[in-house]
Interface confidence: low
């Protein structure tokens, strides 16, 4: 399997909520043996390998973000942790995953990774990651609401409030 | 900070049993798998087993399988090791681990001082 | 089971020199799931770089570590007096995790 980043970029105004997504590709085995480990955390584009250091996202680390179940399951994190630091990560049947961030501010800029382990019998298989880039603005020459530039062209697409929803 | 205490260890027949303990401070113990890896006197390290962060899955090298339990109460941050059958080739210095992730998917980022254990008629 | 093989046993060299100690894995690594660990008598071992080439939370950036699939290397650039320890590799990349079996880095 593997995983997709829809945009690989995320411009936002300060104050505006936003949702970072990734997308499971490919056959997932949906066994009784197999689950599915996936999590968000901040990193840096290093000399080696994009996502290779693993930060935590206000405070919280990939362990307190993370979701486990089976296959192509719905999901979504322990809310009051989370949810104290403006943070929900949540996925769905469809191999969608997502952490929304709330209140965003300058701060938050950065490089965001999901990643995505496969578990088979309790032994690590598979271990796969996307990367994109979240720009916070301010000021006059940020954008009312979050615009997002698709991973595959440069076409941006703007992303008013009611967009960002969970997914329970 | 991360601490990681093993206790337990001593001198013990062969055939008997011993129970090691780790605990654990200076973080999410219910975050991290754990592990335990021990060392022959003046020989290398050799891995002895994993517990998930939950207690819900483990695993074993070969040669202490059948013979070791791992477990943990993660409402007292505490691993444990519990050895039945004890032989003269498990006499070790026996360390506690961390699993950097929830399962054994990531390295050992911290280690506790060990505890030795000497199998001995 | 994933055999690792440390080369030189044993390394004799003098502060400010480079070292290079090598790694080398049975069968492939996938991922380059391989960690390195610095040990002193009486301590317990010590994370030095972990994913083959990244250095642990406040390892000096003297210590760096390269390769991928089978064959992997850890050099320290410039000895300091505290590097003179022995050096384990391991790989993470299967069931049962192995070690290698250590390389002794020794004063000259």
């Known amino acids: 399997f593997k995983v997709a980043t829809p945009y690989s970029l995320y411009v936002c105004p300060e104050g505006q909520n936003v949702t970072l997504t990734c997308r499971l590709l490919g056959p997932v085995d949906k066994g009784h043996d197999v689950t599915f480990y996936k999590t968000w955390y901040r990193s840096s584009r290093g000399e080696v390998q994009t996502c290779s250091e693993r930060r935590p996202i206000r405070n919280l680390t990939f362990q307190d973000l993370h979701l486990h179940h089976g296959g192509h399951q719905a999901a979504n994190t322990s809310h009051d942790l989370a949810q104290r630091h403006g943070l929900e990560s949540a996925s769905d049947h469809h191999g969608n995953f997502s952490i929304t961030m709330r209140n965003l501010t300058l701060l938050d800029s950065g490089l965001y990774c999901c990643l995505v382990v496969e578990i088979r019998h309790h032994h690590s298989e598979h271990r796969v990651h996307g990367a994109m880039e979240l720009q916070v603005q301010t000021g006059k020459d940020a954008p009312s609401n979050c615009v997002v530039y698709p991973s595959s062209s440069q076409e941006s697409e703007n992303i008013t409030a009611h967009h960002h929803h969970h997914h329970h | 900070q991360v601490q990681l205490v093993e206790s337990g260890g001593g001198v013990v027949q062969p055939g008997r049993s011993l129970r090691l303990s780790c605990a654990a401070s200076g973080f999410t113990f219910s975050h991290h798998a754990m592990h335990w890896v021990r060392q022959a006197p003046g020989k290398g390290l050799e891995w002895v087993a994993i517990i998930w962060y939950d207690g819900s899955n483990d695993d074993y090298a070969d040669s202490v399988k059948g013979r070791f339990t791992i477990s943990r109460d993660n409402s007292k941050n505490t691993l444990y090791l519990q050895m039945n059958s004890l032989r003269a080739e498990d006499t070790a210095v026996y360390y506690c681990?961390?699993?950097?992730?929830?399962?054994?998917?990531?390295?050992?980022?911290?280690w506790g001082q060990g505890t030795l254990v000497t199998v001995s008629s | 089971e994933i055999v690792l093989t440390q080369s030189p046993a044993t390394l004799s060299l003098s502060p400010g020199e480079r070292a290079t100690l090598s790694c080398r894995a049975s069968?492939?690594?996938?991922?380059?799931?391989l960690a390195w660990y610095q040990q002193k008598p009486g301590q317990a071992p010590r994370l030095l770089i972990y994913?083959?080439?990244n250095r642990a939370t406040g390892i000096p950036a003297r210590f760096s570590g390269s390769g991928s699939g089978t064959d992997f290397t850890l050099t320290i650039s410039s000895l300091e007096p505290e590097d003179f320890a022995t050096y384990y590799c391991?790989?993470?990349?299967?069931?049962?995790?192995?070690f290698g079996q250590g390389t002794k880095l020794e004063i000259k």
């Open positions: 391991q790989q993470y990349n299967s069931y049962p995790y192995t």
């Open positions: 681990a961390r699993d950097s992730g929830f399962y054994s998917s990531y390295y050992f980022d911290y």
């Open positions: 069968q492939s690594v996938s991922s380059s799931y």
């Open positions: 994913d083959a080439s």
